[in-house]
């Protein structure tokens, strides 16, 4: 996949990285769907939000997510084997004050209500893919990506960069 640095190389860089600005470089609303064109939807149930992966009925409106993009600078180390340069990180908010969070203990993706500054669990490194899809890598757990498992979003460990094109971690963004 394009833009993918080897997963292992990111390990130190992600933990060392810092968001260079408190304000995003850009933001926009988009619907999120899987590689197989299933929609990511959000439903309020018992005062908490649930995230679903489902086929929408014809003419059914897609849920929109506010994507906020941040630059993250990470240093190269003296020995020359460190990752240098800038990464593009994203937060995803389907409704006011709620953000997608990585729950690394449960290997789950959850919606949490929180105030800014957002915790690291709400930041995902954005990767562009060959198919013009994107993937979202946990800032807090390098090599772990948002993926689809049993019609839900889950955290999926990707062992090598060859596996970064697996369909279950690929998503499409659409403004329509």
């Amino acid at each position: 996949a394009f833009g993918i640095s080897g997963v292992q190389k990111y390990t130190r860089a992600l933990h060392d990285s810092s968001i260079t600005g408190i304000s995003p470089i850009t933001e926009y609303l988009a619907s999120l769907s899987t590689y197989n064109d299933q929609s990511i939807t959000f439903a309020l149930e018992d005062e908490s939000y649930e995230i679903y992966v489902e086929d929408l009925k014809k003419d059914e409106k897609k849920d929109k997510v506010l994507l906020s993009y941040y630059e993250s600078q990470h240093p190269s180390n003296e020995s020359g084997d460190g990752v240098d340069g800038k990464m593009l990180m994203v937060t995803l908010s389907p409704t006011k004050d709620f953000w997608l969070h990585a729950n690394n203990k449960e290997h789950s993706v959850e919606l949490h209500k929180c105030e800014k500054p957002l915790p690291d669990q709400a930041f995902f490194v954005l990767h562009n893919m060959h198919s013009n899809c994107v993937s979202f890598e946990c800032k807090t757990d390098p090599g772990v990506f948002i993926g689809v498992k049993d019609n839900h979003l889950a955290l999926i460990k990707v062992d090598s960069s060859e596996n970064l094109c697996t369909e279950n971690i690929l998503f499409k963004l659409s403004e329509t």
């Epitope: 850009t26 990752v83 593009l88």
Partner: antibody, heavy 122, light 107 residues
Framework: EVQLVESGGGLVQPGGSLRLSCAAS????????MHWVRQAPGKGLEYVST????????YYADSVKGRFTISRDNSKNTLYLQLGSLRPEDMAVYYC???????????????WGQGTLVTVSS | DIQMTQSPSSVSASVGDRVTITCRAS??????LAWYQQKPGKAPKLLIY???NLQSGVPSRFSGSGSGTDFTLTITSLQPEDFATYYC?????????FGPGTKVDIK
Amino acid sequence: EVQLVESGGGLVQPGGSLRLSCAASGFTFSTYSMHWVRQAPGKGLEYVSTINNNGDTTYYADSVKGRFTISRDNSKNTLYLQLGSLRPEDMAVYYCARQTYTSSWYGGFDSWGQGTLVTVSS
Amino acid sequence: DIQMTQSPSSVSASVGDRVTITCRASQGITSWLAWYQQKPGKAPKLLIYAASNLQSGVPSRFSGSGSGTDFTLTITSLQPEDFATYYCQQANSLPFTFGPGTKVDIK
């Protein structure tokens, strides 16, 4: 300081081939996707090809698909473009470029080489 | 493929002038647009990325705006070193495409 230096250009006959190189320094080459862009004399910029950081995924503009091959050697910090079945319309300055973000192409290309001229003529 | 158009194709201006160049995409590219400056015989130089973000080291007289399909590059007070050709590029999806360029020359 980021540096990209292209080489390998020259005069070639139609139908001939050539290999361009781009030597990278001043950054961790193996963490970046890299790109080739060309510019015909007196014309605008044209995207040619992209390769991801470890070389296992490539993409080509329709105009060069099946004729050009992009590759890289991370141990040598070098990007390549093999040009084949060359046509007069391939005559251009070829630039290698690094994308702004390690993980994403959304930021465009922040570093460019000085370019190498490929002349296709009989 | 996404087509990019630019206007005007050329503009004659004087030092101190405000210059505005527009770029239009054939379909929505959100904010993923870059602007480059190129001088004769030189490589392009990134000025603006993500539509409105100034690349490090670029003077603040350059600014970018827009989203979706319509974008603008503005040079607030043209300096002698700004006479060049300017290109927009969509960085939203492969294959990346460039606008045809706008040449800014001396009036």
